[in-house]
Amino acid sequence: SSHMAPTHQLPPSDVRKIILELQPLSRGLLEDYQKKETGVPESNRTLLLCLTSDSQPPRLNSSAILPYFRAIRPLSDKNIIDKIIEQLDKLKFQHEPETEISVPADTFECKSFILTILQQFSACLESVFKSLNSGPQ
């Protein structure tokens, strides 16, 4: 709609709304994956750079996160991942490039990779939510 502010121009109030939508999706996806894939360790080779370092309070780095969710989509709950991607798209700065992410070929490494993405993303959302809640923006 013509009323919509371009996504990179959303105020903290709207960013907070999106984070509130993302939190249960992320939490649910992580819990379901942990139940399904018991005993899979977190990978120490994957680091999701999910926060921007150039803004105060920290902003969710949607462009860095999106490629990971697009990559794991065929291997996880597509329905939930699509909802997460839809929300992240709203937070994406226009014209920001997305890098290509490849999923490890090894089955065990792949499971560890997915678990790590989900855990880091959940922690990231928590961090952004706290910063949005802590007084003046």
């Epitope: 709609s1 009323h3 502010a5 105020p11």
Partner: antibody, heavy 118, light 111 residues
Framework: EVQLVESGPSLVKPGGSLRLTCSVT????????WKWIRKFPGNKLEYMGY???????DYNPSLKSRITISRDTSKNQYYLQLNSVTTEDTATYYC????????????WGQGTSVTVSS | DIVMTQSPASLSVSLGQRATISCRAS??????????MHWYQQKPGQSPKLLIY???NLESGIPARFGGSGSGTDFTLTIDPVQADDVATYYC?????????FGGGTKLEIK
């Protein structure tokens, strides 16, 4: 045309609970954000909170311990419950739609007046 | 919370003249060059009606006599020329930060 209509009791006893209904036509409450706002006798407007298209709720911290917003998507209605009311909660209560990020509340109900008195 | 201070509290203007209402936010409501400040009109016995969104955008169906300007912390609603139908209370509201907050209102009367 989007229409919102508030309904509920006009008189509530102190210490009791206030429950209001907002009936929406012309749009689905499974899209956008659906807000409650109230206007006190002195004309001051206060934002109370919302329920989102997915059912997520968020409240004004000043009311957090007393307020619940819920919905029934089959009836296209959403609700405000305010507990432990006092005479300070006497106000006209409005429901409103926030349809788009970065926009404003474009449709409001006509308002329903609630008096808290014994 | 962001405090919205409106002035004057009441305003009496002759028909055909200009009415100017000010709103000041206790902190900036801008992000990336956009102002998340809106103006509403409330006539007696009616609900608030959106006039201006994001500081200067005229809502669909609102006459061009209404205009909004400002950025950061200082905003203005202008009605020019004032008509008899404009008798109402006008409110500013910020949607920059939660909780959303409103100005105290400005009551417009005709001289």
């Amino acid at each position: 045309e989007v229409q919102l209509v508030e309904s509920g009791p006009s008189l509530v006893k102190p210490g009791g609970s206030l429950r209001l209904t907002c009936s929406v036509t012309g749009d689905s409450i499974t899209s956008g954000y659906w807000k409650w706002i109230r206007k006190f006798p002195g004309n001051k407007l206060e934002y109370m909170g919302y329920i989102s298209y997915s059912g997520i709720t968020d409240y004004n911290p000043s009311l957090k311990s007393r307020i619940t917003i819920s919905r029934d998507t089959s009836k296209n209605q959403y609700y405000l419950q305010l507990n432990s009311v006092t005479t300070e909660d006497t106000a006209t209560y409005y429901c409103a739609r926030y349809g788009n990020y970065g926009y404003a509340m474009d449709y409001w109900g006509q308002g329903t007046s609630v008096t808290v008195s014994s | 919370d962001i405090v919205m201070t409106q002035s004057p509290a009441s305003l009496s203007v002759s028909l055909g003249q200009r009415a100017t209402i000010s709103c000041r936010a206790s902190e900036s409501v801008d992000t990336y060059g956009r102002s998340f400040m809106h103006w509403y009109q409330q006539k007696p016995g009616q609900s608030p009606k959106l006039l201006i969104y994001r500081a200067s955008n005229l809502e669909s169906g609102i006459p061009a006599r209404f205009g909004g300007s400002g950025s950061g912390t200082d905003f203005t609603l202008t009605i020019d020329p004032v008509q008899a139908d404009d008798v109402a209370t006008y409110y500013c509201q910020q949607s920059y930060e939660d909780p959303w907050t409103f100005g105290g209102g400005t009551k417009l009367e005709i001289k």
